[in-house]
Interface confidence: medium
């Protein structure tokens, strides 16, 4: 369910939400790492609706689902930091 | 059992470069990133950079930008540090970790780093 | 740059004591704290990932708190093996940085 992504170059996300998601309804988390191009971490939920929302990565839910997350799946799980980067 | 084993220390000259590995075991290698610190004798501790194995995907402290470049070799779970155009001020100990980005940023398992002395 | 600040370079305390460390940001790091020990051989280790957890095999006398800019490790009983240097380091923003250190000694 949670995966990193480490090759775009350019951001990805427009605007985030800070609204809770549900995990009943989260089939992919995608957390991308500052750097290549963009300057901040973004966090890509798809949703079993096939649906794309962007996330705000310092939503407090959003941590409490990232340990979850990675409770249930810690030895398969690739890793992004969840990092903002300094202005140039 | 998580590891992240250094390779031994280093006498090196002015002006040379240097090149340092980092062996890790007992994890899924492409899975997570190695973070490297740099200390100075007596000193604090400094964020050289890091990279995230699966893509070689590197990101460095602007400060390190030009002296370290860091890279991988995931046939024997290794991340190597190469060091570039060595004065005294990089006389230190570097040590890798593993990153646990899963949430803070943390640096969960650590070795006892290399010893680099620039002398002539 | 985040400037992690930890305004006790040293510390003096007894065996038993409860010991606080604390850690400062020049910016709020929205909980992104983490604390190290590096014991006096050079070993380091984490204590404390995002403010509060314990990492795995770290006795639970230690302990972290805070929010926004103030941060603080607590000791509750302190034990002999505790003697090490502390720091703290931020991974809100890169790049990540670390405070000075606090150098815990026994009285």
């Known amino acids: 369910i949670l995966e990193a992504h480490y090759t775009n170059l350019k951001c990805r996300c427009s605007g985030v939400i800070s609204t809770v998601v549900g995990l009943n309804i989260i089939d992919r988390i995608q957390v991308t790492p500052p750097g290549n191009g963009c300057p901040k971490t973004e966090v890509v939920i798809w949703t079993k609706m096939k649906k794309v929302i962007c996330v705000n990565p310092r939503a407090k839910w959003l941590q409490r689902l990232l340990r979850h997350v990675q409770s249930k799946s810690l030895s398969s799980t690739p890793q992004a930091p969840v990092s903002k980067r300094r202005a140039a | 059992e998580v590891q992240v084993q250094q390779s031994g220390a280093e006498l090196v000259r002015p002006g040379s470069s240097v090149k340092m590995s980092c062996k890790t075991s007992g994890y899924t290698f492409t899975n997570y990133g190695i973070i490297w610190v740099k200390q100075r004798p007596g000193q604090g501790l400094e964020w050289i950079g890091y990279i995230y194995i699966g893509k070689g995907y590197t990101e460095y402290n602007e400060k390190f930008k030009g002296k370290a470049t860091l890279t991988s070799d995931t046939s024997s779970s290794t991340v190597y540090m190469q060091l570039s155009s060595l004065t005294s001020e990089d006389s230190a100990i570097y040590f890798c970790?593993?990153?646990?980005?899963?949430?803070?940023?943390?640096?969960?398992?650590w070795d006892q780093g290399t010893s680099v002395t620039v002398s002539s | 740059d985040i400037q992690m600040t930890q305004t006790t370079s040293s510390l003096s305390a007894s065996l038993g004591d409860r010991v606080t460390i604390s850690c400062r940001s020049s910016?709020?790091?929205?909980?992104?704290l983490n604390w190290y020990q590096q014991r006096p051989d050079g070993t380091v280790k984490l204590l404390i990932y995002?403010?509060?957890r314990l990492h795995s095999g770290v006795p639970s006398r230690f302990s972290g708190s805070g929010s926004g800019t103030d941060y603080s490790l607590t000791i509750s009983n302190l034990e002999q093996e505790d003697i090490a240097t502390y720091f703290c380091?931020?991974?809100?923003?890169?790049?990540?940085?670390f405070g000075g250190g606090t150098k815990l000694e026994i009285k």
């Open positions: 380091q931020q991974g809100d923003t890169l790049p990540w940085t």
């Open positions: 995002y403010t509060s």
């Open positions: 910016q709020d790091i929205s909980n992104f």
């Open positions: 970790a593993r990153g646990a980005h899963y949430y803070g940023n943390a640096m969960d398992y």
